[in-house]
């Protein structure tokens, strides 16, 4: 597969990662395939200074991140593991909160207004953030 | 200039297979997410599949899902679309289409002039 | 999936008139909405993307409008050439989807 140099045209450059930020809403599943269909991913937060990155760029938004517990445990998309990994969470979060009376809990995990950490309802049309790593190789399957 | 130039389409009976090709010219293919639409005879246009720009990541209609397959050679400025299990109701000529750098959506701005398959036994 | 209707399904105005259809998306779309034009045996051109922009080389005539769920496409002054079917389509979500067709016809 071949590599990628740069980032593309609307997408910032930060620490060897290219970032896209959404100005319209959509539910977690369907903001995971608009950025898999970037041949990227939702974004992965793995340090205190690439949340505030993020943070700053998106702004006082609900925004979808790329961590969700729809499976059971809480997972990264990219496979980064969530035990060892950064977190930060509002107080008391997450919740699977189920007094929203939408059916079922809540299995997405979204920036808030202040930046921390919240599980909400993953059919909620919240902006979205899609992440891809510089010089990695693209997946794609080598030519016989 | 851009264009989109389909092939592969003809008459197969139902249960066979037909690959479609889609050459490209005129723009870097390789930094384009590519479409397959489709419109029956007398009816209107129905999307079946999506491919990222890479082609590790794609997308297909229900009504296609698990017998149609889109996958493109960025090092031949090609897409395909390999129909398997054909049924009458396939029919339909066939078009390539590039998708838009409109950010947030999957919009299509180019489309190439079509490919006729023909299902019937 | 995202149904979008498009009204009328057909048609007949003068040379000179002024055409308007409609599409209603139903669920809020945003602004990602295409207008095509179809004529007999040919492809779909592409005429207006993001609700209201006019795709380059398009006739000034043409315009889009609309957000959200309820969109609107006119002609402000048919020509004879604009005989064709045209579509709305939605791309926001997966699948996408697109209106059932509006054919216009001249009287």
């Known amino acids: 597969g071949s590599e990628r140099t740069c980032c593309p045209v609307n997408w910032v450059e930060h620490e060897r990662s290219c970032y896209w930020f959404s100005r319209s809403g959509k539910a977690w599943a369907d903001a995971d395939n608009y950025c898999r269909l970037e041949d990227a991913h939702l974004v992965v937060v793995t340090s205190w200074e690439e949340q505030k990155f993020v943070q700053h760029h998106i702004g006082p938004v609900n925004t979808w991140m790329g961590l969700h517990d729809q499976n059971g445990p809480w997972k990264w998309v990219d496979g980064t593991d969530y035990e060892t990994g950064f977190k930060n969470w509002r107080p008391e979060q997450p919740d699977d909160w189920y007094g929203h009376g939408l059916g079922g809990g809540e299995d997405c995990a979204h920036f808030t207004d202040d930046g921390r950490w919240n599980d909400d309802v993953c059919q909620r049309p919240y902006r979205w953030v899609c992440e891809t790593e510089l010089d990695k190789a693209s997946q794609e399957p080598p030519l016989l | 200039q851009v264009q989109l130039v389909e092939s592969g389409g003809g008459v197969v009976q139902p249960g066979r297979s037909l690959r479609l090709s889609c050459a490209a010219s005129?723009?870097?293919?390789?930094?384009?997410?590519m479409h397959w639409v489709r419109q029956a005879p007398g009816k209107g246009l129905e999307w079946v599949a999506v491919?990222?720009?890479?082609?590790?990541?794609?997308y297909h209609a229900d009504s296609v899902k698990g017998r149609f397959t889109i996958s493109r050679d960025n090092s031949k400025n090609t897409l395909y679309l390999q129909m398997n299990s054909l049924r009458a109701e396939d029919t339909a000529v066939y078009y390539c289409?590039?998708?838009?750098?409109?950010?947030?959506?999957?919009?299509?701005?180019?489309w190439g002039q079509g490919t006729t398959v023909t299902v019937s036994s | 999936d995202i149904q979008m209707t498009q009204s009328p399904s057909s048609l007949s105005a003068s040379v000179g008139d002024r055409v308007t259809i409609t599409c209603q998306a139903s669920q809020d779309i945003y602004n990602y909405l295409n207008w095509y034009q179809q004529k007999p045996g040919k492809a779909p051109k592409l005429l207006i993307y993001?609700?209201?922009n006019l795709e380059t080389g398009v006739p000034s005539r043409f315009s889009g409008s609309g957000s959200g769920t309820d969109f609107t496409f006119a002609i402000s002054s048919l020509q004879p050439e604009d005989i064709a079917t045209y579509y709305c389509?939605?791309?926001?979500?997966?699948?996408?989807?697109f209106g059932q067709g509006t054919r216009l016809e001249i009287k």
């Open positions: 491919i990222s720009y890479g082609g590790s990541n794609k």
């Open positions: 993001d609700a209201s």
């Open positions: 289409v590039r998708r838009s750098s409109s950010s947030g959506g999957y919009g299509m701005d180019v």
């Open positions: 005129g723009f870097t293919f390789s930094s384009y997410g």
């Open positions: 389509q939605q791309y926001d979500i997966l699948p996408i989807t």
